[in-house]
């Protein structure tokens, strides 16, 4: 039979006077060692049949006395079987055994849940010698019990290579419920059901759960732990907690905020990091993500020119790194740029629009209709052309660069001329007679030099030749023109 002790039970010492008992109360034993702390034990308990021999593990000594009487079997006396107490209270329990004096060096060890308790435990062994036997009491005390002290404690003693084991003493530390699972913060879709879990344990059991949403109890009657709350959906942020109740009282979980996923806020602080003739590098600060991670962003670009057709170019990019290079833009143009980002719920509004300009670029096309002819009387080559279309100048023309290459008898010489932007003709001096002159022209802006025109060749005869005719840029698909005069 297991004896159970509860707090505030009536004291009922096992033995009168200072003889070994299951609990030290007001009696002072012989040879007792001082306690590590002077607490008052919280527990008293009633033993069953004090002094009855242990029925389990006993050692039968082979030694006999002078009168050849065999010694009785050795066993720990029965003590309390189950001690129930509250957390932080003190407890003291013991094992007692009477050992014939013929045995020397008897030691008692304490074990908890199959492991020997060594080191800094308050274990005290007291000896009460008599003529034939010595009563040994091994006491174990815990000044402030914790849940980790829960378990089954036993005493062991070795005699004659035999091990004597006491009955277990079960220590049950009771306290407020202890959460093993608490609700977690979540981000949820509007009007969509979701679950929260709460689990708490004693002892004492049972543990009952009450759910609280925004300070109102969801269930007015207790639910057994563990409890899963199915929230039928939310339209706005809510705070949830759970209360765990047992006979010792109540523990409240942390409150968790459940947020409703929404479309993100628009990005802010869109700024121009770098501009070139045909691209603009922008960055932005993302807005609030609406409790759902950003998936991607969209950059919207429209020409700011009031005469433009108002079409919007859209560039999609990943949400990170909040940076995008807009390409394929016109040079020296004004643009309005806005950024919008999306999460699983949808797209944000567009950020405030910002104005940005591309820089001047080198022209993207060469001058057109290049014509070259020889003015023999002045010993010059006259060159004429048409300037490239305004749209493709990619800036303000500052002039033209003329490349003229003179080739004669294996000798080649290239010369470059810069001419102003006014007009569309130039005159260069003949450098070599009896040679081919190859002319190419490029438009120039502050952004750089554009592509050169297709080459136009003219043959410069030796002095004295009379006939001449102009040479011009070929029609597409023709071979390089060579005009021999």
């Amino acid at each position: 039979a297991i004896t159970e002790a509860r707090e505030e039970a009536k004291p009922y010492p096992l033995f009168p006077g200072p003889f070994p008992g299951s609990l030290q109360t007001d009696h002072t034993p012989l040879l007792s060692l001082p306690h590590a702390s002077g607490y008052q034990p919280a527990l008293m308990f009633s033993p069953t049949q004090p002094g009855r021999p242990h029925t389990g593990n006993v050692a039968i000594p082979q030694v006999t006395s002078v009168e050849s009487k065999p010694l009785p079997p050795l066993a720990f006396k029965h003590t309390v079987g189950h001690i129930i107490l509250s957390e932080h209270k003190g407890v003291k329990f013991n094992c007692s055994i009477s050992v014939p004096n013929i045995y020397q060096d008897t030691t008692i060890s304490w074990w908890k849940d199959g492991k020997e308790l060594l080191g800094a435990h308050h274990a005290i062994t007291q000896f009460y010698p008599d003529d034939e036997v010595t009563a040994i009491i091994a006491s174990f005390s815990i000044t402030s019990v914790q849940r980790s002290d829960n378990g089954s404690y036993i005493c062991k003693m070795k005699i004659n290579n035999e091990e004597i084991v006491s009955d277990p003493i079960y220590i049950e530390v009771q306290g407020l419920p202890h959460f093993t699972k608490q609700p977690e913060s979540m981000n949820v879709t509007r009007n969509t059901a979701f679950n929260l879990t709460c689990q708490a344990v004693g002892p004492p059991e049972p543990v009952n759960i009450f759910w609280v949403q925004n300070s109102s109890r969801v269930n007015e009657q207790p639910e057994k732990s563990p409890s899963v709350l199915t929230v039928p959906g939310l339209t706005e942020m809510a705070v949830f907690s759970c209360e765990a109740h047992n006979d010792k009282g109540l523990t409240v979980s942390k409150g968790v905020q459940i947020n409703i996923k929404a479309i993100p806020s628009p990005p802010t602080e869109v700024s121009i990091r770098n501009s070139t003739a045909h691209s603009i590098l922008i960055s932005w600060v993302p807005g609030f993500d609406g409790y759902s991670p950003f998936r991607n962003c969209s950059i919207q670009v429209k020409e700011a020119d009031p005469l433009s057709n108002g079409s919007v170019m859209i560039f999609n990019t990943s949400a990170l790194p909040h940076l995008y290079q807009i390409k394929q833009l016109q040079a020296l143009a004004n643009y309005s740029i806005g950024v919008s980002c999306m999460n699983e719920i949808g797209w944000s509004a567009v950020s405030p629009w910002i104005l940005a300009s591309t820089t001047e670029g080198a022209p993207s096309v060469a001058p057109l209709n290049v014509t070259v002819f020889l003015n023999e009387s002045s010993d010059n080559v006259d060159i004429r052309w048409m300037k490239p279309p305004t749209k493709q100048q990619d800036g303000e023309l500052v002039g033209y660069r003329i490349s003229h290459v003179w080739q004669s008898a294996g000798i080649s010489k290239e010369l470059l001329e810069e001419v102003g932007q006014n007009g569309s003709r130039a005159r260069i001096s003949v450098q070599v007679h009896n040679a081919t002159c190859t002319v190419r022209i490029a438009a120039v802006t502050r952004g750089g030099v554009g592509p050169f025109s297709d080459p136009v060749k003219i043959f410069i005869p030796a002095h004295g030749w009379v006939d001449y005719a102009p040479s011009s840029t070929p029609a597409p698909g023709n071979a390089d023109p060579v005009l021999i005069i």
């Epitope: 109102s216 269930n219 007015e220 009657q221 639910e223 039928p232 809510a238």
Partner: antibody, heavy 118, light 106 residues
């Protein structure tokens, strides 16, 4: 199947006492609170209060404190509504209802008609 | 305590018509439940927690709302829908009922 069975109609005189029963079946009685709802002839629903079937603790709405008493006989899975010192304005149909989470009344009794007449 | 106002008090509709009744609270609530009651019968659970149809409720019924304004809609009214509909809030104790909207079929 889950149901709440209420006692039959009552005809009482002013000043008398009436006790209405509500017997639950098909579920664990102590898991859900039993609520009482009053409906006067031609009127809407009025929540009177409830009894915690786990602890036995009754809760009364403001207008129903004093002459009204909720009680239980858990072994019979039955809740009771007693009205003392009956008045003419107590003439109504009284419903018991099982309450689940979020104070939703998912099962209702058929109602007990109480007539107060001198 | 929270007061629930249902409007209109009486709603008259022809079969096949779409009708909407509203329930307004004088303070924000988390959920609204709805019950259907026919003369001589006990109320039936109809809508749970704002928008969830109770078992057996026809799909032509829907409900929505948040804060202080909630509504119940019947997309195509049928003769069997004639009843009084009560709303009941969950948000602040005591969890009161509205005064009811009576749906009549012409």
């Amino acid at each position: 199947q889950i149901q709440l069975v209420q006692s039959g109609p009552e005809l009482k005189q002013p000043g008398e006492t009436v006790k209405i029963s509500c017997k639950a079946s098909g579920y664990t009685f102590t898991d859900y609170g039993v609520n009482w709802v009053k409906q006067a002839p031609g009127k809407g629903l009025k929540w009177m209060g409830w009894i915690n079937t786990y602890s036995g603790e009754p809760t009364y709405a403001g207008d129903f404190k004093g002459r009204f008493a909720f009680s239980l006989e858990s072994s019979a899975s039955t809740a009771f509504l007693q009205i003392n010192n009956l008045k003419n304005e107590d003439m109504a149909t009284y419903f018991c209802a099982r309450r689940v989470r979020y104070w939703y009344f998912d099962v209702w009794g058929a109602g007990t008609s109480v007539t107060v007449s001198s | 305590q929270i007061v629930l106002s249902q409007s209109p008090a009486i709603l008259s509709a022809s079969p096949g018509e779409r009708v909407t009744m509203t329930c307004r609270a004088n303070s924000s609530v988390s959920y609204m439940h709805w019950y259907q009651q026919k003369p001589g019968s006990s109320p039936k659970p109809w809508i749970y927690a704002t928008s969830n149809l109770a078992s057996g409720v026809p799909a032509r019924f829907s409900a929505s709302g948040s804060g202080t304004s909630y509504s119940l809609t019947v997309s195509r009214v049928e003769a069997e829908d004639a009843a009084t509909y009560y709303c009941q809030q969950w948000g602040s104790n005591p969890f009161t009922f509205g005064s009811g909207t009576k749906l009549e079929i012409k």
